[in-house]
Interface confidence: low
């Protein structure tokens, strides 16, 4: 399977909400022994590999924001901790999973990574990630709503295969 990022860049005004999205592509085994661990974290564009550094999002670690379920099941974080920080991660039946960030500030600007680990019989089989940039703007040049820029299909940084 692969992880795709439909949008590589999100440009949003301060105070707006945004939902960053990744999508699980390809055949997904729905066996009872197969589960998926999905999470989000901030990173930097490393010299070796994008998403190599796992930083917290608004002081919440990748572990705080993770989802763990079978196949294309729906799930979302109901953690009070995440919601108190204006965050919620979710996953639907179609392989989409997302993180919603409320009331954006300039400090939220940066590189965001989604991570998916496929687990079989307690053994991790594949680990794939996607990356996208969030730019939060203020002042007269800021858009009135979030503007999203699609990823090019050639963008190897935004689709990783297992």
């Amino acid at each position: 399977f692969k992880v795709a990022t439909p949008y590589s860049l999100y440009v949003c005004p301060e105070g707006q909400n945004v939902t960053l999205t990744c999508r699980l592509l390809g055949p997904v085994d729905k066996g009872h022994d197969v589960t998926f661990y999905k999470t989000w974290y901030r990173s930097s564009r490393g010299e070796v590999q994008t998403c190599s550094e796992r930083r917290p999002i608004r002081n919440l670690t990748f572990q705080d924001l993770h989802l763990h379920h079978g196949g294309h099941q729906a799930a979302n974080t109901s953690h009070d901790l995440a919601q108190r920080h204006g965050l919620e991660s979710a996953s639907d039946h179609h392989g989409n999973f997302s993180i919603t960030m409320r009331n954006l500030t300039l400090l939220d600007s940066g590189l965001y990574c989604c991570l998916v680990v496929e687990i079989r019989h307690h053994h991790s089989e594949h680990r794939v990630h996607g990356a996208m940039e969030l730019q939060v703007q203020t002042g007269k040049d800021a858009p009135s709503n979030c503007v999203v820029y699609p990823s090019s299909s050639q963008d190897s940084e935004n689709i990783t295969a297992a």
Partner: antibody, heavy 120, light 107 residues
Amino acid sequence: EVQLVESGGGLVQPGGSLRLSCAASGYIFTGYDMSWVRQAPGKGLEWVSGIDGHFDSSFYADSVKGRFTISRDNSKNTLYLQMNSLRAEDTAVYYCARSSYAVDLAFDYWGQGTLVTVSS
Amino acid sequence: DIQMTQSPSSLSASVGDRVTITCRASQGISSYLAWYQQKPGKAPKLLIYAASSLQSGVPSRFSGSGSGTDFTLTISSLQPEDFATYYCQQHYTTPPTFGQGTKVEIK
């Protein structure tokens, strides 16, 4: 069968350094985050440090931050803990542990432990 | 950091007894709680993760329950090999933190 075997413990003076190793076998090493957990004599368990199985991102307890460095050599299936500026309160049995479910913070396999004694 | 508090710190019981150990988190951790068993001179052994999921190979007399801040480990019928120290651990966030332990001794 999953096996974790620690080595490198011993007696060291305060301010000294020690490097612990943990040799892993029986599973795909790169698929799992790994941690070091310690236990002072007669005391409970304390997580020390963890490292990502894929990217080598590392995490530390406040008590060791800046003094200890976790690393791994995936080609050798080995986890390391470099311990510098050791203090008496670092005296403990050090266990390496594998994260259950790849990137979780529960630990499903543990080594037998290696004793580190910091004393003058 | 999230503090984990276990009670009791020790207990005496007989073979065949039903034993209950409780663990309380200083803040909500959803269902991200693990239980370990440790015998003297040995490494801890994972019994239960995600509050109630039994680790492979662990006898069914061990069970876990709870969510949020309050959790319980139950041994339905204590066996001779169950005399040990039990630790709870939150695996909700970094750093993972452990309870102080509950020693189960022979009465």
